[in-house]
């Protein structure tokens, strides 16, 4: 603790100019004071002034008023500083002395004589209010006041609390009368060193170094740091935690840039044809009769449906066609014959049956042949029976569908999930794609099936070829090669014509 006992001398009266021993001062009592402050004693005794002592220069002769003086010799009020916790009680001895010697340092002069003394014992609380008193004896009267105040930066009822206002990174506060800290606006904490962040700033994802600020931790954004940042390169996806890329409906792949619903998003099939999705950016158009081309954009010739029978040749006309019939046939489609069974019109071992009393005939064809005269070999693939881009193959009396990867069934109508057999190791995420399953690996693993454990910065060695971009971060320690147009493969090492382009997890 630290404080100051202050004593203000106001007036001293010694009208007869007498000393304590009854003698008079000649020519008058040149008066100075000695003050002794000590711990409380019920009976004041001689001994050290435990709380301090002070002397004044000569302040006047016989009777005089003592003026306030703030500095130099004869300072009033008198200051008795202490460096301990103020106990609240004290004993004070004020002595008036006459000196025949030096005005400024009478204490050192020989022949000093006591005029009078007073003793005060009691309690005194720390405070700014002066306690005024007056003491009389038979010869003298002393008016004075006193108080105890705390030294600068000390507070509390015993001046025991040190507090220094500050405004730096170890605290932003002022001091209350009791010595407690009063934080400056925008600061909090026991030492007022913690800034109060922008209202609403997310407690975990944001922080601040000064008031009304909201600095986002890695992976978060927004004014209040409550919005996650999706993985770099995420195109059609969102996140619920940082660096995620959860694909919007109809999108797939590591960056949600693989269009799984190309038909709906782009409507590539023309002229009323049917569009079927088949993996990222993959689709097939099933054309209506009369149209062809990858997108059914090409109108077929009117003769394309082979309307002329019995070997008639077809000629396109502006909005129609015309059949040129071979000898022995007539009609719009050469469907009528002038031949009879006698002309042996049935080919390929077909049996001829007379009709209309021999004026016409009908051929009964053996297996695998068709046509009015059994002239056509049966092609079971003409009806395009294979779905999802399957290839139709004639096999003797039957036909089979050769399905594309990911499809099965007699007509390739069933979609196979390559992910059903959980091919991805170490908790990898499986994606069904046109060319088979692809695994997105968790942190620390890589490989087509997440079977390789990684312990280094995967992109540091520059694993991607042909100008591909290497990514890490979605799965720390993995790398992803995002291939430029025209290259594919886990490291973009193959030109197109090999596996289809997809950013593989390596």
């Amino acid at each position: 603790g630290s404080g100051i006992f202050q004593l203000r001398l106001q007036e001293f009266v010694n009208q007869r100019g007498m000393l304590a021993n009854g003698q008079s001062c000649e020519p008058g009592c040149r008066t100075f004071f000695r003050i002794c402050l000590k711990h409380f004693q019920a009976t004041f005794s001689e001994g050290p002034c435990t709380f301090g002592n002070v002397s004044t220069p000569v302040l006047g002769t016989n009777s005089f008023v003592v003026r306030d003086k703030n500095s130099g010799s004869g300072r009033n009020p008198l200051q008795l500083p202490f460096n301990f916790t103020w106990p609240g009680t004290f004993s004070l001895n004020i002595q008036a002395w006459h000196t025949p010697g030096d005005d400024l340092r009478p204490e050192t002069s020989p022949g000093n004589s006591l005029i009078s003394q007073i003793i005060i014992q009691g309690s005194l609380a720390v405070g700014k209010i002066w306690r005024t008193d007056e003491q009389n004896d038979t010869l003298t009267r002393l008016s004075y006041s006193y108080r105890v105040i705390c030294s600068d930066n000390y507070y509390g009822e015993s001046c025991s609390r040190l507090c220094k206002k500050r405004d730096d990174h170890f605290g932003h506060y002022e001091c209350q009368p009791d010595g407690s800290l009063s934080c400056l606006p925008g600061w909090t904490g026991k030492y007022c060193d913690q800034p109060i962040c922008l209202s609403g700033c997310h407690e975990q994802n944001g922080y601040c170094s000064k008031p009304d600020e909201c600095i986002c931790r890695p992976g978060w954004q927004g004014r209040l740091c409550n919005e996650c940042i999706p993985h770099n390169g995420c195109r059609h996806g969102t996140c619920s935690i940082p660096w995620q890329c959860a694909c919007d409906e109809g999108w797939g792949g590591l960056f949600c840039d693989q269009d799984l619903n190309y038909c709906t998003h782009h409507s590539p099939c023309k002229n009323g044809s049917t569009c079927s999705n088949s993996g990222p950016k993959g689709y097939t158009c099933t054309c209506l009769p009369g149209y062809t081309g990858e997108h059914c954009e090409l109108g077929l010739s009117k003769c394309a449906s082979n309307p002329c029978r019995n070997g008639g040749s077809c000629k396109d006309q502006e909005n129609s066609y015309h059949c040129l019939c071979p000898p022995g046939y007539y009609g719009q489609h050469c469907e009528h014959s002038t031949l009879t069974c006698a002309d042996s019109p049935c080919f390929n071992g077909g049996s001829c049956r007379e009709r209309n009393q021999g004026s016409s005939y009908a051929c009964e064809c053996p297996p695998n042949f068709t046509g009015s005269n059994c002239e056509k070999k049966v092609d079971r693939c003409t009806s395009n029976p294979c779905a999802n881009g399957g290839q139709c193959q004639n096999r003797g009396p039957s036909r089979t569908c050769r399905c594309r990867p990911g499809f099965t069934g007699t007509h390739c109508e069933l979609h196979i999930s390559d992910c059903a057999r959980s091919p991805c190791a170490h908790g990898g995420t499986c994606h069904d794609l046109e060319n088979g399953p692809v695994c997105t690996c968790p942190a620390g693993f890589s490989g087509r099936r997440c079977e390789v454990r990684i312990t280094h910065d995967a992109c540091a060695s520059g694993p991607c070829f042909n100008g591909a971009t290497c990514y890490t971060g979605l799965s720390p320690n993995n790398f992803v090669c995002n291939c430029p147009y025209g290259f594919v493969g886990s490291r973009c090492e193959f030109p197109v014509g090999l596996p289809p382009s997809f950013p593989w997890v390596a």
């Epitope: 040190l162 405004d167 990174h169 170890f170 030492y191 922080y207 170094s209 600095i215």
Partner: antibody
Framework: EVQLQESGPGLVKPSETLSLTCTVS??????????WGWIRQPPGKGLEWIGD???????YYNPSLKSRVTISVDTSKNQFSLKLSSVTAADTAVYYC?????????????WGQGTLVTVSS | SYELTQPPSVSVSPGQTASITCSGE??????VSWYQQKPGQSPVLVIY???KRPSGIPERFSGSNSGDTATLTISGTQPMDEADYYC?????????FGYGTKVTVL
């Protein structure tokens, strides 16, 4: 008990960048009660405060060095680092890292053993 | 910039009292720390918050601070107290060290 350990090259060429790391053990660098400071002492001379950092990344630098100093923190490794660019022979000193305690009103109660960095070609 | 001034050296006989001063403008309004540094060693905090001693620091070390001057007092000085002593205060957000005082125990 908290321990601090400085590490980095003992020799740096003039005009290059001095880089030191202080590793804290026996306590978390992410405590809200501490700042983490760098102090240097040229041979035969007194102590000079360089700057300090809070675990959130807030930094404070000596104005006389501010244009050349960068202090950073890596809470995951319990480390903080000093970079001093464009060094000259006058930057030759023993570099100390220390913990500055808010409760001690900024007093540094734990110091590293110091590492001598000499700037010379 | 803020400066703290210390006497370059102080000599004291064993068992006597050594007083080291540290002067700076309105230093009494700042908290002062004192550090002891022996040759080839790191500084050690001996006084913080003007007069408080960290645990393990002997009672013969005491401090005070008022006006423009802070004082470190070593009473009953021992030969092991021979060292350099630095005062330190904060001026806004900058740490400031005194120039240091070499205490020699005669």
């Amino acid at each position: 008990e908290v321990q601090l350990q400085e590490s980095g090259p003992g020799l740096v060429k003039p005009s290059e960048t001095l880089s030191l790391t202080c590793t804290v053990s026996g306590g978390s660098i992410s405590s809200s009660s501490y700042y983490w400071g760098w102090i240097r002492q040229p041979p035969g001379k007194g102590l000079e405060w360089i700057g300090d950092i809070y675990y959130t990344g807030s930094t404070y630098y000596n104005p006389s060095l501010k244009s050349r100093v960068t202090i950073s923190v890596d809470t995951s490794k319990n480390q903080f680092s000093l970079k001093l660019s464009s060094v000259t022979a006058a930057d030759t000193a023993v570099y100390y890292c220390a913990r500055e305690d808010v409760i001690l009103r900024g007093g540094s109660d734990y110091w590293g053993q110091g590492t001598l960095v000499t700037v010379s070609s | 910039s803020y400066e703290l001034t210390q006497p370059p050296s102080v000599s004291v006989s064993p068992g006597q009292t050594a007083s080291i001063t540290c002067s700076g403008e309105r230093l009494g309004d700042k908290y002062v720390s004192w550090y002891q540094q022996k040759p080839g060693q790191s500084p050690v905090l001996v006084i913080y918050e003007d007069f408080k001693r960290p645990s393990g620091i002997p009672e013969r070390f005491s401090g005070s601070n008022s006006g423009d001057t802070a004082t470190l007092t070593i009473s009953g000085t021992q030969p092991m107290d021979e060292a350099d002593y630095y005062c330190q205060a904060w001026d806004r957000d900058t740490g400031v060290f005194g120039y240091g005082t070499k205490v020699t125990v005669l």
